[in-house]
């Protein structure tokens, strides 16, 4: 019968006793940077080409006994998970292996860097189809390794890496912390985060998604027909590399940004028990388990968006946090979040010719996060319209006044330390959905975009009594681009998007008490692109 991990990543319409996905990734080459491998294992023979690249440190210990099957164990298993003919994800993908880890599974930053350079040169000498690079390794944070990954990604290569097995914030490790890399955490058959002894999968904002990574059956280097179970984020990353190979084989022109958005979009949502993660990491960690798309074609009509969290600003009074979208993505909205509730909002601003989302800490605050909503919107022309603090008691408002521009997000930012609880809520005038509204002491920023066929609408959900969390979701066929709270709710900790749902978080009700200011309204801006829908219909 089908191994649990292959069943888990398979959409229901393809499920059978045997794993037989529609396209095996035959147009894609996957580079594996790992240990040596047993290339004559019948699971991978003829599918994996062992390059002559080897850059590994000496094994530790004088009594270390180099046994071939042990040296090959990790790499052979991963090659099998990616493209094995029996238990592999992308059965048609061809692979090339580079040895950067020694028989004890240890490597160096320099060895990995030279390996990445080897791939870049190979790509220049003999350009092939789409390339996926699997980096099933994790070490301490390395600026130079992250930069090398960025360079390769910008050359059109898809890099997939393990989040790490340290039960820690993945942002503290490389290459997991490189924004251009697709970073994968591990889950088990119950869709729970994988525990490995006293440790387990890494987590946090640097993880893009999770994938099966416990009791994964794959080729064993013990013998030509041997199989073995292994666990870890390396195995999880191998699943995503396989899924990526299949997606790229079906749509070879996909960019890294498009691929990442599709991986997120087609993942199983909200199935992971977040209680496993440290409390402060739960909101930052994506609740996504990788899966193959239900169809390898025809996803182009969708407006894809993802949420990108910044690093924590730190607690200093003027501290700020910045969240950035990938080069091919548009920043359609910006929000902020603070666990203490002390923040001075957020704004979208230009930086290096691109919009970024900046959140501001407040005096006495423990720090803030900036949350960017990053979307794929071809031929988009977006700008930010700002209204300075208003004198009028009606509050500050700003709208998209350019012809053909629609509102995709609202942000507000204030200079005063505390907007105070005595100010009455500002209600949005009915019939004027294309504008952002805020406190009179706040400057308001509207994200206004023009793109072919783009249409957006505002959806609100208000709760009169105090609630720790208020949500509003976009309906089927619409994508959440903006998420904010209506002003007047001074105890709001912030707003952020989780998949297609806008979440507004408030202070613990028991500490705020029930007052007239208890009302919380979550405001979602939901968009769709008729142009993308028409384009995909024409292609079919």
């Amino acid at each position: 019968s089908i191994p649990w991990n292959l069943e888990r990543i398979t959409p229901p319409r393809y499920r059978a006793d045997e794993y037989q996905p529609p396209d095996g990734g035959s147009l894609v080459e996957v580079y594996l940077l790992d240990t040596s491998i047993q290339s004559d294992h019948r699971e991978i023979e003829g599918r994996v080409m062992v390059t002559d690249f080897e850059n590994v440190p000496e094994e530790d210990g004088t009594r270390f006994h180099r046994q071939a099957s042990k040296c090959d164990s990790h790499g052979t298993h991963l090659a099998g998970v990616v493209s094995g003919r029996d238990a592999g994800v992308a059965k048609g993908a061809s692979m090339r292996s580079l040895r950067v880890l020694n028989c004890q599974g240890k490597g160096t930053v320099s060895g990995t860097l030279i390996g990445l350079e080897f791939i870049r040169k190979s790509q220049l000498v003999q350009p092939v189809g789409p390339l996926v690079v699997l980096l099933p390794l994790a070490g301490g944070y390395s600026r130079v390794l992250n930069a090398a990954c960025q360079r390769l990604a910008r050359a059109g290569v898809v890099l997939v890496t393990a989040a790490g097995n340290f039960r820690d914030d993945a942002c503290l490790y490389s290459p997991a912390s490189a924004p251009e890399v697709i970073t994968v955490g591990a889950t088990n058959a119950q869709d729970q985060p994988v525990t490995l002894g006293t440790l387990g999968t890494n987590f946090g904002r640097c993880v893009d998604l999770f994938a099966p990574g416990e009791d994964i059956i794959g080729a064993s280097s013990d013998c030509s027909t041997c199989f073995v179970s292994q666990s870890g984020t390396s195995q999880a990353a191998a699943h995503v590399a396989g899924i990526a190979a299949m997606m790229l084989s079906a749509e070879p022109e996909l960019t890294l940004a498009e691929l990442r958005q599709r991986l997120i979009h087609f993942s199983a949502k909200d199935v992971i028990n977040e209680a496993w993660f440290p409390e402060d990491q739960r909101v930052l960690t994506p609740n996504l388990v990788a899966a193959l798309p239900p169809s390898t074609h025809g996803a182009g009509w969708q407006l894809f968006c993802r949420t990108v969290w910044s690093a924590h600003s730190g607690p200093t009074r003027m501290a700020t946090a910045v969240a950035r979208c990938a080069p091919d993505e548009e920043l359609l909205s910006c929000s902020s979040f603070s666990r203490s509730g002390k923040r001075r909002g957020e704004r979208m601003e230009a930086q290096g010719g691109k919009l970024v989302c900046r959140a501001h800490n407040a005096f006495g605050g423990e720090g803030v996060y900036a949350i960017a909503r990053c979307c794929l919107l071809p031929q988009a022309n977006c700008s930010v319209h700002t209204a300075p603090p208003a004198e009028a008691s009606m509050g500050t408002r700003v709208h998209c006044h350019q012809q053909g521009h629609v509102l995709t997000g609202c942000s507000s930012h204030w200079e005063v330390e505390d907007l105070g609880t005595h100010k009455p809520p500002v209600l949005r005038p009915r019939g004027q959905p294309n504008q952002c509204v805020g406190h009179r002491e706040a400057s308001i920023h509207a994200s206004c975009c023009h793109a072919p066929g783009l249409e957006c609408k505002v959806k609100e959900h208000g709760i009169p009594a105090p609630q720790e969390q208020v949500t509003v979701a976009c309906e089927e066929g619409w994508t959440l681009t903006g998420c904010s709270a209506l002003p007047g709710t001074s105890h709001v900790l912030g707003a952020y998007a989780v998949d297609n749902t806008c979440v507004v978080r408030s202070r613990d009700v028991s500490t705020t008490g029930s007052t007239s200011e208890g009302a919380v309204t979550a405001v979602a801006i939901c968009c769709r692109s008729r142009h993308l829908a028409q384009a995909s219909q024409e292609l079919q």
Epitope: A16, D17, E18, Q20, D40, R42, E43, E45, G46, S73, R85, D86, A87, K91, G92, I217, S220, D222, C223, S224, T225, C226, F227, V228, S229
Partner: antibody, heavy 119, light 113 residues
Framework: QVQLVQSGAEVKKPGESLKISCKGS????????ITWVRQMPGRGLEWMGI????????RYNPKFQGQVTISADKSISTAYLQWSSLKASDTAMYYC????????????WGQGTLVTVSS | DIVMTQSPDSLAVSLGERATINCRSS????????????LAWYQQKPGQPPKLLIY???TRESGVPDRFSGSGSGTDFTLTISSLQAEDVAVYYC?????????FGQGTKVEIK
Amino acid sequence: QVQLVQSGAEVKKPGESLKISCKGSGYSFTNYYITWVRQMPGRGLEWMGIIYPGDSYTRYNPKFQGQVTISADKSISTAYLQWSSLKASDTAMYYCARDHWSKPFSDVWGQGTLVTVSS
Amino acid sequence: DIVMTQSPDSLAVSLGERATINCRSSQSVLYSSNNKNYLAWYQQKPGQPPKLLIYWASTRESGVPDRFSGSGSGTDFTLTISSLQAEDVAVYYCQQYSSFPITFGQGTKVEIK
């Protein structure tokens, strides 16, 4: 039910070519390996080689490499064993059998094809 | 290649008596990663294809009578027929399936005394 049905007995002259077949049914043919085994008259079993019909990956016993060709047509769930130039020493019973990655031994066998090569 | 050697070449046992066949591999077929012995036993009756009896050295194939049992580990293995029946007259082969080329023992012929 799961079965492998082999083509009928063949009588050939030395130097002639031959292709015998093995058709699988009752299971997912592309997800199992097909093994070919030779048994010369009054002798034991010899493993000749293997094919994975999913991608036509083959592995031969060095003893038979270059002497025979193993192939498969997954569209009709059939594996083949062929000779381009038969020799008298090829006279034997040839069996096909299937195996799976989780059970890499031969759990189902064909009935056998007797090949006689004589001038 | 892994060489499989069976003993004896032939064996005559009275009905209802125990028959024991040995098989030795030239190198271990036990693998530490999954703690399995990659060894199978087959029965071949005259004019029939071989039939799987035992795999992983000691696991009986479904439908095989429980008088057949396999034991051993590493390089030394045994097939035991606890109470020989008339229908057990056949040639028995051991096989290692861990390494290419896959190899069989030369066979042990079991007859009734």
